[in-house]
């Protein structure tokens, strides 16, 4: 806290300028209005301030706003958005685009912030849904964002959002959060074309059932070994061999240095050794010919 | 034209103090804050501080706090730096640099520096 | 403090080349308060670019500055035999003023 102390003849500031950079943390708390401030924090950046000296135009904000700043001072927060806690922004109504760009991009090069988490909680919460161009901007300057989501938040995607996710978006996603964008995906791009549909689908693979796999096999895709490795093993496993190769199509040589890995290898156990060879790349451990397969999925299922 | 002057090179010892001056001319010495930078041989360039001629206030990089003094005399249009607690590693080329006529924050107009050499 | 890191630390070119210099911040410079620097052996800064895309007076045309938020860039379009010098980046947004490492530029 910062003593209340009397400003010093002269030095009332009249305007937000660089002027106040030569006053001292006590001379800031007593000479400058706090009004003044709120209706010039435009001018805020662009004065080179210390961190100390943004602590003390914090305090006279806090004093100012006790129940959260409105939105025309906080688009212009500027440095002084890294002084504010989880506490200070959830006080805030934060519900233009341009007021959360403008404070993600004084974020910009750190990893999101426990402030930067509220701010997006807080404003995704005031529009009711992730909307593309707010998904837009939040893949934008956090391409992880999407699956740092709950399944139960990402329910709230609308389908049309899924235009503005990149592959990268979905890197580390697990396969519970591609559960729920891949249906989302397959109903955002139903109406392209069968090789324009695999390139925008394929990221979200991960989340497919088996007829899925089994209807892209007939549209000659050629899915890549790395796309293969992360679709669901329960997925893969009723994919016949005739089925696998052509949906990997020339990729399906890649099948061999990946045998010992899942879903490969458990599909690999799933399927005739006969069917296996006619691929020629020496892949074992299928079932030996003259064994009888039962599907004891189905024998319980019946029973 | 707009000129910045320092003072000679210096040989100091360590614990010792060192003053360096910086003569403008050509423009109003009031009207523009001043900067001091100082380079380490062979080094990058590094912040001191700066100060505003018309009232002497000054705006300290941290770690020169409590060891840098900045002051000037209106009526001859010169700044000082002062460094006090010297050690080896002040070993550098001192400049003072006027700001940008727009940013406070960049530097318009530098004088020609000031070798400081600590040594025992 | 916010950290500039310039790269590379030395380009090597022949005049009449074009040379790209960067420059990254550790966070955002939101009104894009850069500079950049010429320093040449035995003499003292001289100032190419302000506020990131500035020319500074008396700068030739071949100098540019671009960039925004964390990352900059100086081109020289077109290198002159007086160009080979050390380029320093600095911030102002915030103070104290930092200075990135510096990226010499020297005759192939």
């Known amino acids: 806290e910062v003593e209340k102390t009397a400003c010093p003849s002269g030095k009332k500031a009249r305007e937000i300028d660089e002027s106040l950079i030569f006053y001292k943390k006590w001379e800031l708390e007593a000479c400058v209005d706090a009004a003044l401030l709120a209706t010039q924090m435009d001018r805020v950046n662009a004065i080179p301030f210390t961190y100390e000296q943004l602590d003390v135009l914090k305090h006279k904000l806090d004093e100012l706003y006790p129940q959260g700043y409105p939105e025309s001072v906080i688009q212009h927060l500027g440095y002084l958005f890294l002084k504010m806690s989880p506490e200070d922004i959830r006080k805030w109504n934060v519900t233009s685009l341009e007021t959360l760009k403008a404070l993600l991009e004084v974020n910009k090069g750190h990893e999101m912030s426990p402030q930067v988490a509220t701010l997006i909680d807080r404003f995704v919460k005031g529009r009711g849904q992730l909307d593309k161009d707010t998904l837009d901007t939040l893949t934008a300057f956090y391409p992880g964002y999407l699956c740092s989501l709950s399944p139960e938040e990402l329910s709230s995607v609308p389908p049309s959002s899924i235009w503005a996710v990149r592959p990268q978006d979905l890197d580390t996603c697990d396969p519970r959060q591609l559960d729920v964008l891949y249906p989302k995906a397959r109903l955002a791009f139903q109406n392209m074309n069968g090789s324009e549909y695999f390139v925008k689908i394929q990221s979200f693979l991960g989340g497919a059932p088996t007829e899925d796999l089994k209807a892209l096999s007939q549209q000659n895709v050629s899915m890549d070994l790395a796309t293969f490795m992360k679709l669901r093993t329960d997925a893969v496993l009723p994919l016949t061999v005739a089925e696998v190769q052509k949906l990997l199509g020339p990729h399906v040589e890649g099948l061999k240095a990946e045998e010992r890995h899942r879903p490969v290898r458990d599909w690999i156990l799933r399927q005739r050794q006969d069917d296996l060879d006619t691929l020629g790349l020496g892949l074992q451990g299928g079932i030996p010919n003259g064994y009888l397969v039962l599907d004891l999925s189905m024998q319980e299922a019946l029973s | 034209q707009v000129q910045l002057v320092q003072s000679g090179a210096e040989v100091k010892k360590p614990g010792a103090s060192v003053k360096v001056s910086c003569k403008a001319s050509?423009?109003?010495?009031?009207?523009?804050?001043l900067h001091w930078v100082r380079q380490a041989p062979g080094q990058g360039l590094e912040w001191m501080g700066i100060?505003?001629?018309?009232?002497?206030?000054?705006n300290y990089a941290q770690k020169f706090q409590g060891r840098v003094t900045m002051t000037r005399d209106t009526s001859i249009s010169t700044a000082y730096m002062e460094l006090s607690s010297l050690r080896s590693e002040d070993t550098a080329v001192y400049y003072c640099?006027?700001?940008?006529?727009?940013?406070?924050?960049?530097?318009?107009?530098w004088g020609q520096g000031t070798l400081v050499t600590v040594s025992s | 403090d916010i950290v500039l890191t310039q790269s590379p630390a030395t380009l090597s070119l022949s005049p009449g080349e074009r040379a790209t210099l960067s420059c990254r911040a550790s966070?955002?410079?939101?009104?894009?308060?850069l500079a950049w620097y010429q320093q040449k052996p035995g003499q003292a800064p001289r100032l190419l670019i302000y506020?990131?895309?500035n020319r500074a007076t008396g700068v030739p045309a071949r100098f540019s500055g671009s960039g925004s938020g964390t990352d900059f860039t100086l081109t020289i379009s077109s290198l002159e035999p007086e160009d080979f010098a050390v380029y320093y980046c600095?911030?102002?947004?915030?103070?104290?003023?930092?200075f990135g490492q510096g990226t010499k530029v020297e005759i192939k």
């Open positions: 600095q911030q102002y947004g915030s103070f104290p003023a930092t």
């Open positions: 050509g423009y109003t010495f009031t009207s523009y804050a």
């Open positions: 100060i505003n001629p018309q009232n002497g206030g000054t």
């Open positions: 966070q955002s410079l939101t009104s894009n308060q």
């Open positions: 640099a006027r700001k940008h006529k727009y940013r406070i924050g960049s530097m318009d107009v």
């Open positions: 506020d990131s895309s």
